[in-house]
């Protein structure tokens, strides 16, 4: 058993039929010695008396809020949560496996630049009685500070018969140098509690590997005189690290006809302009990627030829 | 190739072309190592990230773009003195910091070159003949060092009398390649920045 936060405890249980469970001793936080009784949740049934209560925790029915009283007055609470281990593996029932970039990916994180700011998100089908708490650090043995905000519900989607909820959190490394060469990864730890079930999820990454620039901005077309060609131009996104001559981007330019069956023409360029043959109903799209370290491409910025 | 590769435009900062070749060569070599050594811990997640230049050179700090020198987190630099001549400075009025930066890059390349050559000598003795260092990568390191053209004592190649542990050598190769790729990214960023300024 260990303390998650004040008056909240996690009991780690090997979860299999007829498992013996864990013996837990609860102590009432009071100077009183006599006349103390214990109850569980809203029940008025007295479970025991005395300053300490010994219980055998085997299943969710044994978890919950234990309260010690004296003469009708509440003295203290202890909330017991269960963390299940099945076949040596901690349960992952609360969050959905996103399977990207690989199986057993519950947390996904992205950064728009090298400032040390990043966003992580996760998915669940659970809508109520759910809380998350997020901690992060750079490295684990001698951790350096990363500050995370509160996790918030950021999107709701319908997937078949199920509703899916996306939660996200923003974190910022306390003292980040955009030009630094990372040798210790960022660690992100999410504590998830659904009713009386506790689970934890972790992710470890280098900022350089989770970079995904915002799409290029101000994508514009300028017709060229006496020609069916247009000059396409765009700019670095505002959120990208500066100076741009140091943090350079490469761009992918794509021309797509009206019909999806038409072959796309696609090419890479380091410049922020290109000349394009713009046919009626075609569209031009541009996306960005770090020029020197190939992490994710941005989403496309698009403009119609008409 | 049908014709000898054309030299880059002489108006261009002379080292940019070489640094782009370096990043491509080390990225290709790392990809090859990850494929060939698929049953060894050779991915970014599996290896320990070591920097053989740590406390010996200060490339990141010495090559910091001016715009980032106001960022306190970037300024934990170590005082290091380097020789300050070099042909990448080609007829430009360069600051002391730029010379320091380029000489730090040169020292990095020299240290990696020695490590890679020593390692290659060991890998050549491996009866499995599983992996060797790409000669193109070694040549590109050499070309960039020549373009930087700093005078510096030659470091003798490390020789070892004991029987090499090929498993450890291959893991060390992965560690070195990952670290060198990260440094090659920094070098490319620096050359691009200097070319623009």
């Amino acid at each position: 058993i260990w303390e998650l936060k004040k008056d909240v405890y996690v009991v780690e249980l090997d979860w299999y039929p007829d498992a013996p469970g864990e013996m837990v001793v609860l102590t009432c936080d009071t100077p009183e010695e006599d006349g103390i009784t214990w109850t569980l949740d809203q029940s008025s049934e007295v479970l025991g008396s005395g300053k300490t209560l010994t219980i055998q925790v085997k299943e969710f029915g044994d978890a919950g809020q234990y309260t010690c009283h004296k003469g009708g007055e509440v003295l203290s609470h202890s909330l017991l949560l269960l963390h299940k281990k099945e076949d040596g593996i901690w349960s992952t029932d609360i969050l959905k496996d996103q399977k990207e970039p690989k199986n057993k990916t519950f947390l996904r994180c992205e950064a728009k630049n090298y400032s040390g700011r990043f966003t992580c998100w996760w998915l669940t089908t659970i809508s109520t009685d759910l809380t998350f708490s997020v901690k992060s650090s750079r490295g684990s043995s001698d951790p350096q500070g990363v500050t995370c905000g509160a996790a918030t519900l950021s999107a709701e989607r319908v997937r078949g018969d199920n509703k899916e909820y996306e939660y996200s959190v923003e974190c910022q490394e306390d003292s980040a140098c955009p030009a630094a060469e990372e040798s210790l990864p960022i660690e992100v730890m999410v504590d998830a509690v659904h009713k009386l079930k506790y689970e934890n999820y972790t992710s470890s990454f280098f900022i350089r590997d989770i970079i995904k620039p915002d799409p290029p901005k101000n994508l514009q077309l300028k017709p060229l005189k006496n020609s069916r060609q247009v000059e396409v131009s765009w700019e670095y996104p505002d959120t990208w690290s500066t100076p741009h001559s140091y943090f350079s981007l490469t761009f992918c330019v794509q021309v797509q006809g009206k019909s999806k069956r038409e072959k796309k023409d696609r090419v890479f360029t380091d410049k922020t302009s290109a000349t394009v043959i713009c046919r009626k109903n075609a569209s031009i799209s541009v996306r960005a990627q770090d020029r020197y370290y190939s992490s994710s491409w941005s989403e496309w910025a698009s403009v119609p030829c008409s | 190739r049908n014709l000898p590769v054309a030299t880059p435009d002489p108006g261009m900062f002379p080292c940019l072309h070489h640094s782009q070749n370096l990043l491509r060569a080390v990225s290709n070599m790392l990809q090859k190592a990850r494929q060939t050594l698929e049953f060894y811990p050779c991915t970014s997640e599996e290896i320990d990230h070591e920097d053989i230049t740590k406390d010996k050179t200060s490339t990141v700090e010495a090559c910091l773009p001016l715009e980032l020198t106001k960022n306190e987190s970037c300024l934990n630099s170590r005082e290091t003195s380097f020789i300050t001549n070099g042909s990448c400075l080609a007829s430009r009025k360069t600051s002391f910091m730029m010379a320091l930066c380029l000489s730090s890059i040169y020292e990095d390349l020299k240290m990696y070159q020695v490590e890679f050559k020593t390692m290659n000598a060991k890998l050549l003795m491996d009866p499995k003949r599983q992996i060797f260092l790409d000669q193109n990568m070694l040549a590109v390191i050499d070309e960039l060092m020549q373009a930087l053209n700093f005078n510096s004592e030659t470091v003798p190649q490390k020789s070892s009398l004991e029987e090499p542990d090929f498993y450890k050598t291959k893991i060390k190769l992965c560690i070195l390649l990952h670290a060198f790729r990260i440094r090659a990214v920094t070098i490319d960023r620096v050359m691009s920045y200097l070319n623009a300024s």
């Epitope: 060609q229 330019v253 021309v255 072959k263 796309k264 023409d265 696609r266 090419v267 890479f268 360029t269 380091d270 410049k271 290109a274 000349t275 394009v276 043959i277 | 190739r1 049908n2 590769v5 054309a6 030299t7 880059p8 435009d9 261009m12 072309h17 782009q20 070749n21």
Partner: nanobody
Framework: EVQLVESGGGLVQAGGSLRLSCAAS????????MGWFRQTPGKGREFVAA????????DYANSVKGRFTISRDNAKNTAYLQMNNLKPEDTAVYYC?????????????????WGQGTQVTVSS
């Protein structure tokens, strides 16, 4: 393996036009970005223009923008450079090059295959 042969060079007066052709052998022509470079004595090879595999996206050196047009015909395995309003400073040997990296405007060193070049002379 791709073999490239340029043609169409020659002597022309300032203000005149020329059309260079680059014929490629090999079935994979449409997989290569095609570029034109030029070289004057004692100078490095200078980028002129490049065109994407599908022929719809191109890039030009500032010095030729609005005067030169690059195009390609994948059915004929040929790339073209239409040069209008030629100036004496356009005098050079023009090379056609092929690049599998699918990059429009990288340096000459990134092109895998080169033609032998065709001389263009613009007299004033």
């Amino acid at each position: 393996e791709v073999q490239l042969v340029e043609s169409g060079g020659g002597l022309v007066q300032a203000g005149g036009s020329l059309r260079l052709s680059c014929a490629a052998s090999g079935r994979t022509f449409s997989a290569y970005v095609m570029g034109w470079f030029r070289q004057t004595p004692g100078k490095g090879r200078e980028f002129v223009a490049a065109i994407s595999t599908g022929g719809q996206i191109s890039d030009y050196a500032n010095s030729v923008k609005g005067r030169f047009t690059i195009s390609r015909d994948n059915a004929k395995n040929t790339a073209y450079l239409q040069m209008n309003n030629l100036k004496p400073e356009d005098t050079a040997v023009y090379y056609c090059a092929a690049n599998r990296e699918n990059f429009l405007n990288r340096g000459a060193g990134d092109y895998e295959y080169w033609g032998q070049g065709t001389q263009v002379t613009v007299s004033s």
